[in-house]
């Protein structure tokens, strides 16, 4: 089948890194500079992605694969393929529409990206709190209270003054 197909369509013989050049009697021509084709049988080569500004090059473009970008220090990638760079915040903060804001009591963020999240409720998984949470760290859950040996005690975090939430986004 493949042989039959290639007789019918000469372009199917063109490997990755080339394109089927209609202007040259459908022969396989190498992709021009700053372009690539990642699969065979392509009639055009795709333009290489350019990592400019807040983007920096993680992997150079080759004739068979696109460039890959990441973000300069102080920023992190968002979206598949790092389609956007977003400002970092500190741990214990989240990025809102008004800039970086500290996590509210009862919430934490252990990364430089993302949101402040409520501390894990250990009791929902039948466990107890071994270590209290902070703005930067979730609580650490341990064995269930029934599993603790006599005399051992677990640390119970102070009850939040209100339902754990986070600063406005």
């Amino acid at each position: 089948f493949e042989r039959t197909r290639s007789l019918q369509d000469p372009c199917s013989n063109c490997p990755a890194g080339t394109f089927c050049d209609n202007n040259r009697n459908q022969i396989c021509s190498p992709c021009p500079p700053n372009s690539f084709s990642s699969a065979g049988g392509q009639r055009t080569c795709d333009i290489c992605r350019q990592c400019k500004g807040v983007f920096r090059t993680r992997k150079e473009c080759s004739s068979t694969s696109n460039a890959e970008c990441d973000c300069t220090p102080g920023f992190h990638c968002l979206g598949a393929g790092c389609s956007m760079c977003e400002q970092d915040c500190k741990q214990g903060q989240e990025l809102t529409k008004k800039g970086c804001k500290d996590c509210c009591f009862g919430t934490f963020n252990d990364q430089k990206r993302g949101i402040c999240r409520p501390w894990t409720n250990c009791s929902l998984d039948g466990k107890s709190v071994l270590v209290n949470g902070t703005k930067e760290r979730d609580v650490v859950c341990g064995p269930s209270p029934a599993d603790l040996s006599p005399g051992a005690s677990s640390v119970t975090p102070p009850a939040p003054a209100r339902e754990p939430g986070h600063s406005p986004q």
Partner: antibody, heavy 120, light 106 residues
Framework: QMQLVQSGAEVKKPGASVKVSCKAS????????MHWVRQAPGQGLEWMGW????????NYAQKFQGRVTITRDTSASTAYMELSSLRSEDTAVYYC?????????????WGQATLVTVSS | SYELTQPPSVSVAPGKTARITCGGN??????VHWYQQKPGQAPVLVIY???DRPSGIPERFSGSNSGNTATLTISRVEAGDEADYYC?????????FGGGTQLTVL
Amino acid sequence: QMQLVQSGAEVKKPGASVKVSCKASGYNFSGYYMHWVRQAPGQGLEWMGWINPKSGGTNYAQKFQGRVTITRDTSASTAYMELSSLRSEDTAVYYCAREGGARGVDLDTWGQATLVTVSS
Amino acid sequence: SYELTQPPSVSVAPGKTARITCGGNNIGSKSVHWYQQKPGQAPVLVIYYDSDRPSGIPERFSGSNSGNTATLTISRVEAGDEADYYCQVWDSSSVVFGGGTQLTVL
């Protein structure tokens, strides 16, 4: 390429439990929160909860607290969702979804779905 | 708990512009994400953080968010855009979805 592959369809009796798996590939499993979302036939999307694969920390929707348990096996890059005390209303398609990290929790990669049917 | 309200259905002729709204109290202060779901398929993120497009999503898809309404706009609508669309936000420890809008291309 990022991919989430879920376990196959399940048929359960009322009162039983079901455990659905979600195997991640193509990215650092521990670096991104994993969520579970379900969709009853002909209905909308309903969020169930998340897990932080790095720490194992969880957060569940109030509706499912006490019935759902989300766990992970980092060595296998796999998250699990177990739902207990099943009833007919739990018949739904269940999805795992990776959080992309944008402000306000975006779900940028979804599993292919697992159909759970609860019937006596 | 926070609620998001979407119209159940929106109809549009091919080539025209479709607008799908998502209402919520002071939703403009939140980050809104939009998903497209075709029959028998998993949802796909089409807009995140109000107006940003993931790679691979056509420029015809755009979003805005202010006051009490977020809007997904699809310009030059094609038959392949026919699907259910869901808005979603994060609110005080919960992920919240709108009820969904069925987009019909006439």
